[in-house]
């Protein structure tokens, strides 16, 4: 019962985590304009992995996609890749874990197969969560570096005569969503791995049998062999690699007219 609960909870936690990773990847607020200690501008800038947006003081928001692939910073490309790999692995993990759920009966699937699938999905969730956390952390590091660089250059003008204030960017909501979602996926994966141990079928323990040999009275007690969670040399663990590409459908945002007061 505890195993089923652990597996079910792991699945739900991972599902929420992967949904969060997808949401974070699609969000536009990866970096937002830093308003602290900055001249107050009548526009508000924020950027995502796929497009950058400008919100006018009227509330009108204009977003522009990054239509170049080669012109983008390598770090941004790396973050995109990490997030997409995380989503793909997570999605496959979810698919595998559905069939691995103890509460779902599919034909005459053995418990050892379910245990295998549970561990596979668990590992996938762990890697997926790590990819998301890594992606978000790389982006955050990039922001911190750029923030301090632009702070240092903030008031370097033309011979000190004209002040050109650089727009500084700070952490956006997507980063926090990504960190939490990655963490949840990781936790879900660990729970699946724990559940896998309890799912493995236990081999029958033979009761001690007394053999009476002539001449000597010797009792043989063969030890009870416990199953080694079904992942011994007889079980093949295959790593699943996926090179799935993701096509991005840009969703039209419907901004509020009244974001700014």
């Amino acid at each position: 019962m505890a195993v089923t609960a652990c597996q079910g909870l792991g699945f739900v936690v991972s599902l929420i985590g992967i949904a969060g990773i997808i949401a974070a990847t699609c969000m536009d607020q990866w970096s937002t304009q830093d308003l602290y200690n900055n001249p107050v501008t009548a526009v508000f800038n924020y950027q995502g992995l796929w497009r950058s947006c400008v919100r006018e003081s009227s509330g009108f928001t204009e977003c522009r996609g990054y239509f170049t692939l080669l012109g983008l910073p390598a770090m941004l490309q790396a973050v995109r890749a990490l997030m997409i790999v995380g989503i793909v692995l997570g999605a496959i993990g979810l698919l595998v874990s559905i069939f691995a759920l103890k509460c779902i009966r599919i034909g005459s699937m053995e418990d050892s197969a379910k245990a295998n699938m549970t561990l596979t999905s668990g590992i996938m969730f762990i890697v997926s969560g790590l990819c998301a956390i890594a992606g978000v952390s790389v982006f955050a590091n990039m922001l911190v570096t750029n923030f301090w660089m632009s702070t240092a250059n903030m008031y370097t003008g033309m011979g000190g005569m004209v002040q050109t204030v650089q727009t500084r960017y700070t952490f956006g909501a997507a980063l926090f969503v990504g960190w939490v979602a990655g963490g949840l996926t990781l936790i879900g994966g660990v729970m699946m791995c724990i559940a896998c141990r309890g799912l493995a079928p236990e081999e029958t323990n033979y009761k001690a049998v007394s053999y009476h040999a002539s001449g000597h009275s010797v009792a043989y007690k063969p030890g009870g062999f416990k199953a080694s969670t079904g992942f011994g040399s007889n079980t093949k663990n295959k790593k699943i690699y996926d090179g799935g590409a993701r096509t991005e459908d840009e969703v039209q945002s419907y901004p509020s007219k009244h974001d700014y007061v």
């Epitope: 526009v43 800038n45 006018e56 009227s58 002040q163 050109t164 204030v165 727009t167 009244h258 007061v261």
Partner: antibody, heavy 119, light 113 residues
Amino acid sequence: QVQLKQSGPELVKPGASVKMSCKASGYTFTSYVMHWVKQKPGQGLEWIGYINPYNDGTKYNEKFKGKATLTSDKSSSTAYMELSSLTSEDSAVYYCARRGYYGPYFDYWGQGTTLTVSS
Amino acid sequence: DIVMTQSPSSLTVTAGEKVTMSCKSSQSLLNGGNQKNYLTWYQQKPGQPPKLLIYWASTRESGVPDRFTGSGSGTDFTLTISSVQAEDLAVYYCQNDYYYPYTFGGGTKLEIK
């Protein structure tokens, strides 16, 4: 067509207060932010502040904080500006101007309210 | 506050002439997010409220004759009237539309001979 109709000229004594209005028509009043601009005789333009009629949110030029109070009435599609503790420095033409939704500009202006502060 | 400096303060030309007026801001009005310059030009005829001419430094408002052209980026901007007409007699104001408080230039008064 969009119209911003401002109240008539005002002649007030120093130290008094005055409340001028700007009635909007031809568009959805709550969808656009209303700004107020001051112009002294023969001089340039000065931004006072704005009111968002949707949520009554305001933003003021620091120079006019405590001097101007912006309000609006959704039911009559009217924006108001009250000026307090008037001095001769407040004698000017005051314009209400609608902020464009798609771009950074004032696309429609009222005809202006002339305020004269004199004893 | 951002200081907007317009020059010349007044200008007298004959009809058909080309006119250029300058506007300088104390800080860059270029927004890195969309690469647009938040500078607006207004025309104010005697006894009338200002009228929008150009926004985003170079985008002409609909209904504005194409003889009016805005240019420039960052801190230096120019309004050009390719062939001045009698009805162009007015004061022209540039405005910082990027930083609060919004600030206007002192204006360039255009007079026709």
